[in-house]
Amino acid sequence: SPTPFGPEGQLADELHKPKAIQTEVKPSVRFNLRTSKDPEHEGCYLSLGHSQPLEDCGFNMTAKTFFIIHGWTMSGIFENWLHKLVSALHTREKDANVVVVDWLPLAHQLYTDAVNNTRVVGHSIARMLDWLQEKDDFSLGNVHLIGYSLGAHVAGYAGNFVKGTVGRITGLDPAGPMFEGADIHKRLSPDDADFVDVLHTYTRSFGLSIGIQMPVGHIDIYPNGGDFQPGCGLNDVLGSMAYGTITEVVKCEHERAVHLFVDSLVNQDKPSFAFQCTDSNRFKKGICLSCRKNRCNSIGYNAKKMRNKRNSKMYLKTRAGMPFRVYHYQMKIHVFSYKNMGEIEPTFYVTLYGTNADSQTLPLEIVERIEQNATNTFLVYTEEDLGDLLKIQLTWEGASQSWYNLWKELRSYLSQPHNPGRELNIRRIRVKSGETQRKLTFCAEDPENTSISPGRELWFRKCRDGWRMKNETSPTVELP
């Protein structure tokens, strides 16, 4: 039987299926206070209007209270991410109350029916919160609703219906189908809590988008552009995960939001930073690594509340597994001239050398054509902390744009065998670290030799801190 939300085709079928005769189920929502990190422990079930379980189970009225809200399910069981998240919350916030909202009977339905049940589940959570508010010392400001997939919209309804304002809602890849473009009262939105932060990990602009593409919080974070997650490709999945099908790719990418959040809880010393940007392409070009004016933030649990922000889209790259943190660098390369380039498009590769470690050879992703006699901006990222950068090795290769151009090049070479080689002229590379916000300039090791042919290498050494640019002073930046 297929995993929840996958593969895409099955969900598409679900959306167009006539309503089947369902097994009669109790329209019930249960609240399980997880009193132990042991996932096998049965915990304590809270009951609206009954104070005794609160006392018996040691509910801490003054502590933070997390409500974990699952999504649609095709198997009817709690999936394994749940106990991982419960354990991580207990590890990070030892005194906190961790409550699992069990709406499995209402989620174990046709997708369309589960969607229609989100409102009633949200209402049940709101009623539970309203009742808890009647208790001394319980504060709605200490409540953090964490909803995965369809559960994110349930959290939105709960925040909307409760008397007062919930402290925080985290949406972990909120469900897309039937919510994309919906009215703010029919989906998760910034109005639903004092702070709404969202991680988008499975969005697609083509085909069915399992996760919602539109921003729905105060901050909306799109790791790896919010679409293709490292370690979730079919090749990765075939080798390392159960089942090894397109179903697992969908599950891997959709569920990545949960694991990024878990990572932020357990790897507090390795926080991942996201950077505000208007779109994914601009981020890929490396032009959005600024922390000025709240333009960067930690992701997941460590995210800082950003006031007066609506729908701030933020981006970052990640590793394929925990810890997910990478180190982002903006690289500005001024290509002074082409020599005998023809129709060839260069691909750059850099190796970064630092005080702590050296990077692998990293390709510079070309989002737009490389301009000559212009400064080209790139984004590179490393999985390890290199420390302070000391030097950079640059190489390039030519990739022909078409077979016709390749033939033209070959014919040109055969007719003029002594044709001088193709060369690029690069004198300096400017680098900005996203994580430290430090700016450095690297100059060609030999100022007299700044031309580089394909396959050859050019070395650049740090020549000064900062970027000497007209009318620009580099502000001191403190990361959040």
């Epitope: 189920v25 019930s28 399980n32 042991d38 996932p39 079930y45 009817g76 106990h83 069990d102 159960a242």
Partner: antibody
Framework: QIQLVQSGPELKKPGETVKISCKAS????????MNWVKQAPGKDLKWMGW????????TYADDFKGRFAFSLETSASTAYLQINNLKNEDTATYFC?????????????WGQGTTLTVSS | DIVLTQSPASLAVSLGQRATISCKAS??????????MNWYQQKPGQPPQLLIY???NLGSGIPARFSGSGSGTDFTLNIHPVEEEDAATYYC??????????FGGGTKLEIK
């Protein structure tokens, strides 16, 4: 202590119906899922499916869809397995086994088994 | 469905020696650093009893001579030193996120 006690052995003819019970004690019945597992004589274990003891929603493995039905009597902390239109190949020992909703889905407590013999 | 293949089908081990039983899954049963593989012991006329859960964790009341290891698709149950009472059939069982949950074909252990 935690116990799952199943009903006694059954001898049935092909075409008949049997209902096997599994009574739980020592824990809150609705807080754990209940599985059913089949073991034919001299054969390995085969998972038949499970029932959510709170909602009453059953889930069946593909080979056990149709003639098989899981049900509950929550007030008596009892789960039932009913097999309709019995066939000779239903001859086996049937086990109930519980698992934690919140955990890693292993089966920590088992009933003693109910032997069903189907013979004309 | 995930198919679990156990080997050997039967083995005879001398008292005090080590018994090693292997279980190979048709696909990985790993998830985020954990392996969802369990082991059960079944004696004639009795129900199975949980020995090991999540590949290497000892079930409640199970003696330390039982141990489990492995990840991905390859798992092993070790019994050392083997005792008389360990004569039984041993089953592996995968409990990944998505049913159907499946069992291996069993390994019958005899004590010499």
């Amino acid at each position: 202590q935690i116990q799952l006690v199943q009903s006694g052995p059954e001898l049935k003819k092909p075409g008949e119906t049997v209902k096997i019970s599994c009574k739980a004690s020592g824990y809150t019945f609705t807080n754990y899922g209940m599985n059913w597992v089949k073991q034919a004589p001299g054969k390995d274990l085969k998972w038949m499916g499970w029932i959510n003891t709170y909602s009453g929603v059953p889930t069946y493995a593909d080979d056990f869809k149709g003639r098989f039905a899981f049900s509950l009597e929550t007030s008596a902390s009892t789960a039932y397995l009913q097999i309709n239109n019995l066939k000779n190949e239903d001859t086996a020992t049937y086990f109930c086994a519980r698992f934690s909703y919140y955990g890693r889905h292993y089966f920590d407590y088992w009933g003693q088994g109910t032997t069903l013999t189907v013979s004309s | 469905d995930i198919v679990l293949t156990q080997s050997p089908a039967s083995l005879a081990v001398s008292l005090g020696q080590r018994a090693t039983i292997s279980c190979k899954a048709s696909q990985s049963v790993d998830y985020d650093g954990d392996s969802y593989m369990n082991w059960y012991q079944q004696k004639p006329g009795q129900p199975p009893q949980l020995l090991i859960y999540a590949a290497s964790n000892l079930g409640s009341g199970i003696p330390a001579r039982f141990s489990g290891s492995g990840s991905g698709t390859d798992f092993t149950l070790n019994i050392h030193p083997v005792e008389e009472e360990d004569a039984a059939t041993y089953y592996c069982h995968q409990s990944t996120d998505d049913p159907p949950w499946t069992f291996g074909g069993g390994t019958k252990l005899e004590i010499k």
